[in-house]
């Protein structure tokens, strides 16, 4: 089969790295400077990306792969292949139309990316706040407020013994 | 214009070795890409080896692991090292860069 795609496209000859050249009769020519082809039987080369302004180099062009970039300290990457780079905020904080601000009483952000985030709601789960949230930090759970009434152990008692004929007083 | 002369061609045996020289004239070397092609009878040129814009050498499935090809900027000189040619080697040779070509040198590969 191969043999067969080859005699009818000679395109399919060109390995990554060139492109089949129809000025040249679709013989194989290596990538001009500054492009790449990154699988065989191409007809044309791929212009590097170029990694500018608050994109730098992670990986630099070849005639084989495309360059990959990331964000300059203060930004991180956002979108398939880092397309975009989005300002740091704090921690307690996220990213609006007007910059970094606080996040509100009630919600939190641990991280320098992303929104504030409501903090758990305890008793949903039938538990109590043992730790309160902060703008960094979400509340911490614990244990139910039954547990904690006085006299209340973490071991439940065995149900005392019955006689029978009595109904429980 | 760059020109391009190639010598080193010849009749060599199978499981001999010839080597490909390139000189341009030019500063041609320092920044485009170097490639070696073939042409047997009757068949399209092919690309043998290359060596890419971003300095690293390729090759052809049929060259790899018998063909070398380097570079020297110093002498405007490409080579094309060939170890254990076969039969099927036998064609003319031709040195390439950008959108200049060399005469093309013979190689023919018989016993």
């Known amino acids: 089969f191969e043999r067969t795609r080859s005699l009818q496209d000679p395109c399919s000859n060109c390995p990554a790295g060139t492109f089949c050249d129809n000025n040249r009769n679709q013989i194989c020519s290596p990538c001009p400077p500054n492009s790449f082809s990154s699988a065989g039987g191409q007809r044309t080369c791929d212009i590097c990306r170029q990694c500018k302004g608050v994109f730098r180099t992670r990986k630099e062009c070849s005639s084989t792969s495309n360059a990959e970039c990331d964000c300059t300290p203060g930004f991180h990457c956002l979108g398939a292949g880092c397309s975009m780079c989005e300002q740091d905020c704090k921690q307690g904080q996220e990213l609006t139309k007007k910059g970094c601000k606080d996040c509100c009483f009630g919600t939190f952000n641990d991280q320098k990316r992303g929104i504030c985030r409501p903090w758990t709601n305890c008793s949903l789960d039938g538990k109590s706040v043992l730790v309160n949230g902060t703008k960094e930090r979400d509340v911490v759970c614990g244990p139910s407020p039954a547990d904690l009434s006085p006299g209340a152990s973490s071991v439940t008692p065995p149900a005392p013994a019955r006689e029978p004929g009595h109904s429980p007083q | 214009a760059v020109q391009l002369v190639e010598s080193g061609g010849g009749l060599v045996q199978p499981g001999g070795s010839l080597r490909l020289s390139c000189a341009a004239s030019g500063n041609i070397f320092s920044i485009r890409v170097s490639a070696w092609y073939r042409q047997a009878p009757g068949k399209q040129r092919e690309l043998v080896a290359w060596?890419?814009?971003?300095?690293?050498?390729h090759y052809a499935d049929s060259a790899k692991g018998r063909f070398t090809i380097s570079r020297d900027n110093t002498k405007k000189t490409a080579y094309l090292q060939m170890n254990s040619l076969k039969l099927e080697d036998t064609a003319v040779y031709y040195c390439n860069s950008g959108d200049s070509w060399g005469q093309g040198t013979q190689v023919t590969v018989s016993s």
């Open positions: 060596i890419a814009w971003d300095n690293i050498a």
